[in-house]
């Protein structure tokens, strides 16, 4: 790249016009403060490219650095950039304006940093002060960049004199961050291995400096050294990795593996550690189990979840009534086992829109060549109560018999109630539950049957009314944890010629 006039620094008169030309072997352009100002690009007769930047009617605000760069940085040979700096002395402008974020300067460790207060005139004398103290600090000043040095956590201002007036800059705030200059990460292919398996630990550091990797590991104690493989990692940003590999682990290889990365031999740098467990045999252990009886509701979906810890990864089987379950094509059943962490797993059986036929005895088995666990439970499918029949009969002895039959799971409870005022019953008058009346008036008999094939209970309750002297509304109500159902019948005395 060639800049004309060559610079590297120009001092322009205010309101003047200035022309800069940059030439190169590929298309070029001018940049100013990461912006691309208006410019004229051209291809020359000799095959070179140029761009002309014309600064017209310049002000102090035009003070700053200008870069000529290749338009499209294709490869390292075109990453070259040329810099020039322009001053436009402007007595009306003190310090060049700063973005508010540039007033906060964060420093890591004890590194040099720059307080970037700049003026438009390179002849001006500029001093740096702690804001609270008026004594100038002895820090080198570069009119193009500002004050560069090592600064404490304080507030600073820059001062200059233009004509006969003293001008102060904005306040700069310096904060030091205690951050290591090296960013190290360590991970292992597996942190749990069986004896005889391999251990592989990877240590990665950001940056492209020449760094020293120092590993410490349990084998070192017995003088058996492992040669790590250290290399750059492909891609950008640049990183360097070191891999420690032990092909055949022993129980004594359990312990802490530390990767220490330093820039120089006497520098502590940064280190990260990881714990490795070498075990004699694999294992499977249940962490979260299910109850002896698990409940599902008819036509609702139900997830049965088992959490276990294992190494190596086990095979998992779910069985129902000792028959192996598999994902159903119809989507009624979904089986999945997934990693929660390196050695922790969750296995789920999802029953979609549960059917009565899915009630039964379930088992989950998790196993590998070293160990196995199993977990069994009964799945109960709860079915809402239905009153299937409410009938009335008149035996010859003058009694009135009302029979109520219903089904549900779990076992329904039966409640009988009566109401004598038919006009107001049941909306305006609560029915009277039976049970308080004397034995002579009514007799109740309830039988319960469990139907194995339907996996639900059937309740048959018979109410015998000895004497009915006026029309009576009788309600049979069945209830379980899934809800309730009821039916009513109106019973009339024998003497009345009709029933309502």
């Amino acid at each position: 790249l060639v800049i004309t006039p060559p610079g590297p620094e120009f001092v322009l008169n205010i309101s003047s016009t200035f022309v800069l030309t940059c030439s190169g072997s590929a298309p070029v352009m001018w940049e100013q403060m990461s912006q691309v100002p208006w410019q004229e690009a051209a291809m020359n007769q000799d095959g070179t490219f140029s761009s002309v930047l014309t600064l017209t009617n310049v002000t102090g605000g035009d003070t700053g650095e200008y870069f000529c760069v290749y338009n499209n940085s294709l490869g390292p040979e075109l990453s070259e950039r040329k810099r020039i700096y322009i001053f436009v002395p402007d007595p009306t402008m003190g310090f060049l304006p700063m973005d508010s974020e540039d007033l906060f300067i964060f420093v890591t460790d004890v590194t040099e940093t720059t307080i970037p207060c700049r003026v438009t005139d390179p002849q001006l004398e500029v001093t740096l002060h702690e804001k609270k103290v008026d004594i100038p600090l002895h820090v080198p000043y570069d009119h193009q960049r500002g004050f560069t040095g090592t600064f404490e956590d304080k507030t600073y201002i820059c001062k200059t004199t233009i004509g006969d007036r003293e001008v102060d800059s904005d306040t700069y705030y310096v904060y030091s961050l205690q951050v290591s200059s090296i960013n190290v990460s360590v991970n292992a292919v597996q942190t749990v291995v069986r004896q005889g398996e391999s251990i592989t630990i990877r240590c990665i550091v950001m940056g492209n400096d020449v760094v020293n990797f120092q590993w410490t590991y349990p084998r070192m104690k017995s003088g058996r050294l492992v040669e790590p493989v250290t290399d750059y990692l492909f891609g950008v940003p640049s990183r360097i990795g070191s891999i420690l590999h032990i092909p055949t682990a022993e129980l004594s290889d359990s312990g802490t593996y530390t990767c220490n990365v330093s820039v120089s031999v006497n520098d502590h740098g940064d280190e990260k550690a990881i714990n490795i467990s070498v075990i004699e045999n694999g294992y499977v252990r249940l962490l979260e189990t299910l109850g002896d009886v698990e409940i599902a509701e008819l036509h609702r979906s139900r997830t049965l979840r088992v959490v276990f810890e294992a190494y190596p990864m086990p095979s998992v089987l779910w069985l129902k009534d000792n028959r192996t379950l598999g994902d159903s094509g119809a989507g009624e059943l979904v089986l999945s086992t997934r990693n929660m962490s390196e050695t922790r797993y969750v296995s789920e059986l999802i029953l979609v829109r549960v059917k009565v036929s899915e009630a039964g005895y379930y088992t989950m088995r998790a196993f590998h060549e070293d160990d196995e666990v199993q977990l069994s439970f009964k799945l109960q499918v709860n079915v809402p109560v239905r009153v299937l029949e409410l009938s009335e009969s008149h035996p010859a002895n003058g009694e009135q018999t009302i029979r109520c039959r219903g089904r549900g799971m779990p076992q329904p409870n039966v409640t009988w109630s009566t109401c004598r005022d038919l006009k107001r019953c049941p909306r305006k008058l609560s029915p009277t539950p039976l049970g308080n009346s004397s034995k002579e008036e009514s007799q109740l008999e309830t039988n319960v049957t469990f139907w194995e094939e339907d996996q639900e209970y059937e309740v048959v309750s018979t109410l015998r009314l000895r004497h009915v002297d006026q029309p009576l509304s009788v309600r049979c109500m069945l209830q379980n944890s899934m809800g309730g159902d009821s039916q009513e019948v109106t019973v009339v005395p024998h003497s009345l010629p009709f029933k309502v």
């Epitope: 592989t200 750059y232 990692l233 492909f234 990795g241 891999i243």
Partner: antibody
Framework: AVTLDESGGGLQTPGGALSLVCKGS????????MGWVRQAPGKGLEFVAG????????AYGAAVDGRATISRDNGQSTVRLQLNNLRAEDTATYFC?????????WGHGTEVIVSS | LTQPSSVSANLGGTVKITCSGG???YGWYQQKSPGSAPVTLI????KRPSDIPSRFSGSKSGSTGTLTITGVQAEDEAVYFC???????????FGAGTTLTVL
Amino acid sequence: AVTLDESGGGLQTPGGALSLVCKGSGFTFSSYNMGWVRQAPGKGLEFVAGISAADNSTAYGAAVDGRATISRDNGQSTVRLQLNNLRAEDTATYFCIRGGGSIDAWGHGTEVIVSS
Amino acid sequence: LTQPSSVSANLGGTVKITCSGGGSYYGWYQQKSPGSAPVTLIYYNDKRPSDIPSRFSGSKSGSTGTLTITGVQAEDEAVYFCGAWDNSAGYAGFGAGTTLTVL
């Protein structure tokens, strides 16, 4: 001894695709960066693609970027280079390499000719 | 990476081949004939594979890597490539090669 054996070269048609495989032996394959370097007739060495051991990160040479894919199978100790949309200028001997910052082992090479 | 296109050395003499423009590490590779497999002579500036004769050595000073062959032999006639990691690209680049002629 460290050996790197390439396969998959031969006569290819422009616009077609190429798949080269390199099998490593005699070393812990999973611990090493692997890659491909090529040499066109009468020319120098040119980096094609690389894949890191530590995190499977990849890099591609400018001439093949966007057309190449490199992958590795540590279980099989193999590294594969897939190169699509072949051009005449892809004609070269392709070498499998071990290493990133410095190459410490080379395969014998497999010749690829792209011609109609 | 910049390296001389050719150098010559007397049989039994010493020759140095330089490479500049790289970063932290240089490697040196010998190729006896075009298309034949290169052989790594030096990696990481000065490390020599166990099967490489001790007459080949590597060093780095500043940003320049140097391959030194002491006691040059007739079979050392070959093209020598330098390689170095390129941070901006994220991979290693190569020099154009130096042809060694043994006189």
